[in-house]
Interface confidence: low
């Protein structure tokens, strides 16, 4: 190979020739041919000849730095090396490099490559730069955090001489009992249904469920979505990419629950659901999915058990009738636990209690979901609690409330299984979180969840 | 305009085996479900089995299910039957039907068979 | 399974009678509940849709009525292309069932 080793000196590249044996160097700036060792003169104010450096004028594209380097094999002048910005590589700079080609976006994310960057369309139930936040938490229709006041709609079916009414806020996923879901009233022409979150939040998708009515099966087999900020101005959840109203497939049956994703993802307070197509009456329960704006606040793992057992840990344990087998250990108060014992309860009822996670590494805490319980038909729970974190499991730090400068209360709870959620701004980042029961209504019994994600990438 | 054009039947022995097929045209054939129903000779309607618009749901009568399948292909806008098992009770005109959707204001209910096929005659008999 | 008795299983009626069939259900279907009709060797035919409802198209001397467990079909001048046979269907729940027909004759 005639250009092996290379005949170009000072950086310059060997390019064969057509003809055997011939070749041609592409010099840097400030090198001429015919092996780059001639120097390019540069003429003066006093019109002397002087000789440029290889780094004048700057040889190295996009805003890449020349530095003066090593000799190559002992030429007259001595070489140069461009240090590159991030996103670009070559001799010179030269080439944008795909940062797609490492495939930064996670969970399905469609990555573009930019000029030095690179962005992910993430699908609508993940965020972040690179589509690493889990996005697509219930927002709390199923569990109470949405409370009736926030879930109206345009009519109420009333049946049996107006005695049985299908309200709006019956219409909770995999609500039980014999009136179980809303129904809109039978001369509703265009009804629909409408959750206020009463904040601004992401929300990535809507699972939906029909319901028995008088034994008979009503579901709604399509709908369509709509959003406001204000409540008064609404606007269809399009195609994307398109002016047409986007309609969703529902329910083929009066019990299967059907899950269906925003992409991209809706950003409002309100939410309003569209019945098109139902069998029967439009009958429905519901469950919205998502998360605040910020992302990260997502379920940690007590409900799912990625909490294991041994990273909950209490100040005492209370055992009912002094039996073991009644024992309510802080390993039981996770989330929407069922059974007899299903609850976390204190050995005593005073200010010094404290149930304690352990999350094993620094963790951002943006939220946290509380529960009572029901020990053998006695109503229990937390009604306001403060909460402490530490990293180290000794030094505790009880969260503040940063306009009034004292410990924060926060709102518990007021019935044993109603969820009640409360945002944590500015969110906590920690490894131990504890919660420090600060009024109750019998015992002090938790379950609970803590909403957050793992460190940032 | 809607049709809907049945094929595959015939004789066949007890025992055996037949798939019927319908063939649809004049309607979005992907947003509707659909039935089969049968009657007979000089007998009446019964309903047979019924697929939801996407095909994630079937439903069966009592006296067909276990030996028939009803699946349908949304590209090709075709229903199927699969009969096996065949007995003489099976021997009967067997109609495709499509679920009508009848509007009311913003809402469309279901429960109706607004379009039929012609029929295709299935005699089981030996 | 919800059973759909009709009745009579055949009539006879001259041209320009008013003709009644009757359907009962075996349990409340509400007003779930469809007429069709079946002329020899053709497919069905909707004519009436929630009991009481006309399909577009249908002659407006046919009528439907009822709720719950009893439902009435009417023609209210008979005229000789409704020689047929008459079937209810409920949808309230699966299986849909029909009745066993009304079969309607000129004198």
């Known amino acids: 190979d005639i250009c092996d080793p290379n005949p170009c000196e000072n950086g310059g590249i060997c390019l064969p020739g057509l003809a055997d044996g011939s070749f041609s160097c592409e010099c840097p700036d400030g090198f001429t041919d015919p092996n780059c060792s001639s120097v390019v003169e540069v003429a003066s104010d006093e019109e002397e000849p002087t000789s440029a450096g290889p780094c004048t004028p700057n040889p190295c594209h996009n805003g890449g730095t020349c530095e003066i380097s090593e000799a190559y094999r002992g030429d007259t002048f001595i070489g140069y090396v461009c240090k590159c910005p991030r996103g670009f590589n070559g001799i010179h700079c030269q080439h944008n490099i795909n940062e797609c080609e490492v495939e930064p976006c996670k969970n399905g994310g469609i990555c573009t490559d930019l000029v030095a960057n690179y962005s992910c369309e993430c699908p609508g139930e993940f965020m972040g730069r690179n589509c690493q936040y889990k996005c697509s938490g219930p927002l709390g229709i199923e569990g109470g955090i949405i409370s009736n006041q926030q879930i109206t709609a345009s009519s109420t079916h009333r049946a049996l001489f107006g005695l049985q009414k299908w309200y709006p806020y019956y219409a909770r996923l995999n609500k039980k009992g014999l009136i179980n879901a809303w129904t809109a009233a039978e001369n509703d022409r265009w009804p629909w249904i409408q959750i206020n979150l009463q904040r601004k939040m992401r929300v990535t998708g809507v699972i939906t469920q029909g319901a028995k009515r008088i034994g008979s099966p009503e579901y709604i087999k399509s709908y369509k979505i709509a959003y406001s900020n204000d409540g008064k101005t609404w606007a269809m959840y399009k195609v994307k990419g398109t002016n047409e109203d986007m309609v969703f497939r529902g329910n083929i049956d009066n019990n299967t629950p059907y899950a269906n994703s925003f992409t991209p993802p809706i950003k409002a307070q309100y939410v309003r659901l569209y019945p098109q197509v139902c069998r029967r009456h439009c009958t429905l329960r519901m469950e919205l999915l998502g998360c605040e704006l910020s992302g990260c606040s997502e379920p940690l793992g007590m409900k799912s058990g990625h909490i294991q057992d041994y990273q909950i840990t209490a100040s005492s344990i209370f055992r009912t009738l002094n039996m073991d087998m009644f024992t309510w250990e802080p390993r039981k108060a996770r989330l929407d636990k069922q059974g007899k014992v299903n609850a976390w309860t204190s050995g005593h009822n005073d200010q010094s209690q404290w149930l304690q996670v352990d999350l094993l590494v620094p963790t951002k805490v943006t939220g946290i979901i509380t529960q009572g319980a029901k020990d053998f038909g006695h109503v229990q729970f937390v009604g306001s609690y403060k909460l402490a974190y530490s990293n180290d499991g000794e030094h505790w730090t009880v969260y503040q409330d940063e306009k009034q400068r004292k410990d924060k209360v926060f709102q518990g709870n007021f019935d044993n299984d109603t969820h009640r959620k409360n945002v944590i701004d500015p969110p906590i980042y920690a490894r131990h979180i504890r919660i420090l029961p600060w009024s109750w209504y019998g015992r002090i019994t938790l379950r609970s969840e803590l909403l957050g994600c793992t460190e940032e990438e | 305009e809607v049709q809907l054009l049945e094929s595959g039947g015939g004789l066949v022995q007890p025992g055996g085996s037949l798939r019927l097929s319908c063939a649809a045209s004049?309607?979005?054939?992907?947003?509707?479900?659909m039935s089969w129903v049968r009657q007979a000779p000089g007998k009446g309607l019964e309903w047979v089995s019924a697929?939801?618009?996407?095909?994630?749901?079937?439903y069966y009568a009592d006296s067909v299910k276990g030996r028939f399948t009803i699946s349908r292909d949304n590209s090709k806008n075709t229903l199927y039957l699969q009969m096996n098992s065949l007995r003489a009770e099976d021997t009967a005109v067997y109609y495709c039907?499509?679920?009508?959707?009848?509007?009311?204001?913003?809402?469309?209910?279901?429960?109706?068979?607004?379009?039929w096929g012609q029929g295709t005659l299935v005699t089981v008999s030996s | 399974d919800i059973q759909m008795t009709q009745s009579p299983s055949s009539l006879s009626a001259s041209v320009g009678d008013r003709v009644t069939i009757t359907c009962q259900a075996s349990?409340?279907?509400?007003?779930?509940l469809n007429w069709y009709q079946q002329k020899p060797g053709k497919a069905p035919k909707l004519l009436i849709y929630?009991?009481?409802n006309l399909e577009t198209g249908v002659p407006s001397r046919f009528s439907g009525s009822g709720s719950g467990t009893d439902f009435t079909f009417t023609i209210s001048s008979l005229q000789p292309e409704d020689i047929a046979t008459y079937y209810c269907?409920?949808?309230?729940?699966?299986?849909?069932?029909f009745g066993q027909g009304t079969r309607l004759e000129i004198k």
């Open positions: 039907a499509q679920e009508g959707l009848i509007t009311f204001g913003g809402v469309i209910v279901i429960g109706y068979f607004d379009y």
């Open positions: 697929i939801s618009d996407s095909g994630g749901s079937t």
């Open positions: 269907q409920q949808y309230d729940n699966l299986p849909i069932t």
């Open positions: 929630d009991a009481s």
């Open positions: 004049g309607f979005t054939f992907s947003s509707y479900a």
């Open positions: 349990q409340d279907i509400s007003n779930y």
